[in-house]
Interface confidence: medium
């Protein structure tokens, strides 16, 4: 009889029990598996997925995906992205790959995750005086107000403002009057001038001279080029001949000599090393740029799979040959490993020494040298004006400095001349002509140098020599010799510039040329009626007198007891008395000299606050206030 | 004739791998060198690496390094490629293609084989 | 990104004649890489049309032409045809990839 095996409930996890014979099968419900289904599918536990990735499992719970975060990728999200693949950072910034993201390292001016943000280089504002601030790229660019100038309007635009000087010439101020330096090429008081710069001798060859600012340019006739047009055209200053290509100049052509690698007419193309089948014996040919190299298969070795993987002495009997003659031309073969190969003599190549190695090929001699081949070696024959192992070098006849009075020396095969700059001529430029005659320019009918100044000549041009108290190319400004300082400091009240010459006014108390002697005011003795003198360089007179009782005045020359100092205002009397004279006001007025009211606010109770003194005035609200330290205002408030 | 054919289109699934089968005929297989080259829909053409039948070297491009095998089988006159860890960018017509020197042009190309990635 | 650019479309009317440049660098065609051009029309496989820089297959048109100069080489059509509208591809070589295989990102031909 059969027996149900599933009476027993044998299948967990509400599987169903199929009974069978001599046995039963469980059918599972996911997630569950196994005999009697007591295997739980969980595939996302543990995660496999790395780096916070959420893990998923299929359907079938026999498999899982991971879904990645922001910057990883991969099966198990193991791979770092990398963003910077995708060029994030902006206005040139650097991108560096980290784990998860990626950071921005801004170029100078830029900020942002992806420096995106153009900083704001006017915050705080930079520009001075009242100039207005425009953002820029890590700058900032002020608009100044008028009168000020600069980067950042830190400037005050001085007296030149007017800018009287031409073609980017400095402007020195004078005074009433300025002068001109002129930059190199440019002339005149003004430097409106530009100077000429061609000379009969500037361009060779029949060259046409262009004048420049303190240069010049030559228009050359077919046939010849160089700045002066002293080469006759070589077809290789256009450096024709690429990859480093030897280039022959020819008439009217030229013939590139290419090194090992490249061919074409300008040595353009890599040589297809390939297509002449060097491999022998079945070897692949694997070119790698201007090199190959052949794969050989078993059994062949050597350069070109033309060695057969034996010894040097079965190779020699395999080709009839005693071993010391195998390697042709006295090479050496040497056994290695299970093949051998040859040892050449200087000067042969290939496998079995059998090639005549060329030295001339392709030609290391240059400048229309001939090339010799010998063993191991070759040599260079030059054409005249060129020398080197390769004839590279040309000689330089301008080495001896034959052009005079800054003439230019152009070296050329074999020879050289001299362009000459104005005002020289010969052919080593030794010529200096006299460019201080005539003494008045012929052209403006001025002198060429203003204010008594000397000429004195130079190479293309002149120079003046000022008398004192003038400056300028021509003499022309008037030196302001104030600017100087000359005055001493303390005892100058004012410096006046003169014709070549300054004048100090001095502060009182002070003499000397530049005030700078104290004057002794008490030498003459000026104090009368037994007064006691004390030096005072800070007063007008240079002395103060100390009176004795009962007389007063700057040299104590009044009687205080007499009315003949004391002046009574506002029609008061003077009466005298034993030791000082005193005035007798009218009605409505009071003090010393009846100067103040007698209704001033001081005497009906003190005005002032914080300990403030009152003090009557003449004019109206008739007092003031004298504030102690710490206080100020009308009222000492 | 001189011709490259390929083996047929294929559907993956992300993460597994694809091998194609590209067999020489009509001329020596061990003289030129094989390329596999890739378009996906709507990009241009992508080499991914270069085979010498003659003794299975290879040189493969850097961006599937790692990823990508490629065989030579002289007796059947066929190379293969292998490509693993599909993701959906690997959809694209994949081509064998052959050259005479390991610098040389492409002038005979397979059909292309088809490679769906998808889940 | 293809290291070889070329422009994305170019067209032309029948009988017209157009060009398409390829631009690399000193690392590929300056270096003395040759460059070779392959027409791909859609569903076939790529058909070399003009190899180591200006050369003709046999069987190409002499209505395709083709330079190289520089760092830089271009394909002229001429007499342009209706069966020639298709994708144009320029390849070579590059040293700093170590000789990898460089692609142009291809030209599409429109005849109006």
């Known amino acids: 009889t059969n027996i149900n095996e599933c009476a027993s409930n044998p299948c967990l996890n509400q599987g169903t029990c199929i009974d069978d014979v001599a046995g039963y099968k469980c059918n599972c419900l996911l997630p569950y598996t196994g005999a009697t289904c007591e295997v739980v599918l969980a595939p996302c536990a543990p995660s496999p997925c790395r780096n916070g990735g959420e893990c998923r499992q299929s359907e079938d719970y026999e498999s899982f995906s991971c879904v990645c975060p922001t910057g990883w990728q991969g099966q198990t999200c193991e791979v770092d992205i990398n963003e910077c693949v995708l060029s994030p950072c902006r206005h040139g910034a650097s991108c560096q790959n980290t784990h998860g993201g990626y950071r921005c390292h801004c170029q100078a001016g830029y900020s942002g995750r992806n420096c995106e943000t153009d900083i704001d280089d006017c915050r705080p504002n930079p520009c001075h005086n009242g100039g207005s601030c425009t953002d820029g790229i890590n700058t900032a660019f002020c608009d100044c107000l008028p009168g000020f100038r600069g980067t950042f309007c830190e400037e005050d635009i001085n007296e030149c403002a007017s800018d009287p000087c031409r073609n980017g010439a400095n402007c020195t101020d004078c005074v009433d009057s300025y002068t001109c330096t002129c930059p190199a090429g440019f002339s005149g008081i003004h430097c409106e001038n530009n100077t000429p710069d061609c000379t009969e001798s500037s361009c060779f060859n029949g060259g046409t001279c262009v004048d420049g600012i303190n240069s010049f340019t030559c228009l050359c006739p077919p046939g010849f080029t160089g700045s002066y047009c002293q080469h006759d055209v070589n077809e290789c200053d256009s450096q024709p001949c690429l990859h480093g290509g030897t280039c022959q100049d020819g008439c009217g052509s030229y013939r590139c000599t290419c090194p090992q690698g490249y061919t074409g007419p300008n040595c353009q193309n890599l040589v297809h090393w390939c297509d002449s089948s060097p491999c022998k014996n079945g070897g692949k040919c694997w070119q790698t740029h201007t090199q190959y190299r052949c794969e050989c298969p078993s059994g062949w070795t050597g350069l070109y799979c033309d060695v057969p993987s034996v010894s040097c002495e079965v190779a020699a009997q395999r080709q009839g040959v005693d071993v010391a003659r195998l390697c042709q031309h006295g090479g050496l073969c040497v056994d290695a490993g299970n093949t051998h190969h040859c040892r050449c003599q200087a000067g042969y190549t290939g496998s079995y020494c059998e090639d005549l190695v060329d030295e001339c090929s392709p030609s290391p001699c240059q400048n229309g040298a001939t090339c010799t081949d010998y063993l191991g070696g070759y040599s260079c024959k030059c054409v005249a004006g060129y020398h080197g192992v390769n004839c590279s070098e040309e000689i330089d006849e301008c080495l001896s400095h034959p052009c005079q009075n800054g003439g230019t020396c152009l070296d050329l095969p074999n020879t050289y001349k001299c362009s000459c700059p104005r005002g020289t001529q010969g052919v080593h430029c030794e010529i200096n002509v006299d460019d201080c005659n005539p003494p008045v320019d012929p052209v403006s009918r001025s002198p060429k140098c203003f204010n008594n100044g000397t000429c004195v000549d130079q190479v293309g041009g002149y120079s003046c020599t000022c008398p004192p108290g003038f400056v300028g190319e021509r003499c022309e400004g008037d030196v302001n010799e104030c600017l100087s300082n000359p005055c001493d400091a303390r005892g100058t009240q004012n410096c006046v510039q003169r014709v070549n010459d300054f004048h100090c006014e001095c502060r009182a108390g002070h003499t000397g040329r530049r005030c700078e002697s104290v004057i002794n005011g008490c030498k003459g003795k000026p104090c009368k009626n037994g007064g006691t003198c004390a030096v005072a360089s800070n007063t007008a007179r240079g002395f103060i007198c100390k009176c004795p009782a009962g007389f007063e005045g700057a040299t104590c020359e009044n009687d205080a007891r007499t009315c003949g100092s004391l002046r009574c205002l506002n029609g008061g009397t003077c009466i005298s008395g034993p030791r000082s004279p005193t005035c007798l006001c009218l009605g409505p007025f009071t003090g010393p000299e009846c100067q103040f009211p007698a209704s001033s606010p001081c005497l009906g109770g003190n005005p002032c606050y914080n300990q403030g003194t009152c003090e009557p005035t003449s004019e109206s609200p008739f007092y003031r206030c004298l504030c102690p330290a710490k206080f100020n205002g009308l009222l000492c408030h | 004739q001189v011709q490259l054919v390929q083996s047929g289109a294929d559907v993956k699934k992300p993460g597994a791998s694809v091998k194609i089968s590209c067999k020489a005929s009509?001329?020596?297989?061990?003289?030129?060198?094989m390329h596999w080259v890739r378009q996906a829909p709507g990009q241009g053409l992508e080499w991914m690496g270069i085979?010498?039948?003659?003794?299975?070297?290879?040189s493969y491009a850097q961006k599937f390094q790692g990823r990508v095998t490629m065989t030579s089988d002289t007796s059947a006159s066929t190379v293969s490629m292998e490509l693993s860890s599909l993701r959906s960018e690997d959809t694209a017509v994949y081509y064998c293609t052959r050259s005479y020197s390991n610098y040389d042009s492409f002038d005979i190309w397979g059909r292309g084989t088809m490679v769906t990635v998808s889940s | 990104q293809a290291v070889l650019t070329q422009p994305s479309s170019v067209s032309g009317a029948p009988g017209q004649r157009i060009t398409i440049s390829c631009t690399g660098t000193?690392?590929?065609?300056?270096?003395?890489?040759?460059v070779e051009w392959y027409q791909h029309l859609p569903g076939t496989a790529p058909k070399l049309l003009i190899y180591?820089?200006?050369n003709r297959p046999s069987g190409v048109p002499d209505r395709f032409s083709a330079s190289k100069s520089g760092t830089s080489a271009s394909l002229v059509i001429t007499g342009l045809q209706a069966e020639d509208e298709a994708d144009y591809y320029c390849q070579s070589y590059d040293t700093r990839l170590s000789d990898s295989v460089i692609f142009g990102g291809g030209t599409k031909l429109t005849v109006l």
């Open positions: 085979i010498n039948p003659t003794n299975g070297y290879t």
């Open positions: 180591r820089n200006s």
């Open positions: 009509g001329y020596t297989f061990t003289k030129y060198y």
């Open positions: 000193s690392s590929n065609i300056g270096a003395g890489y040759d």
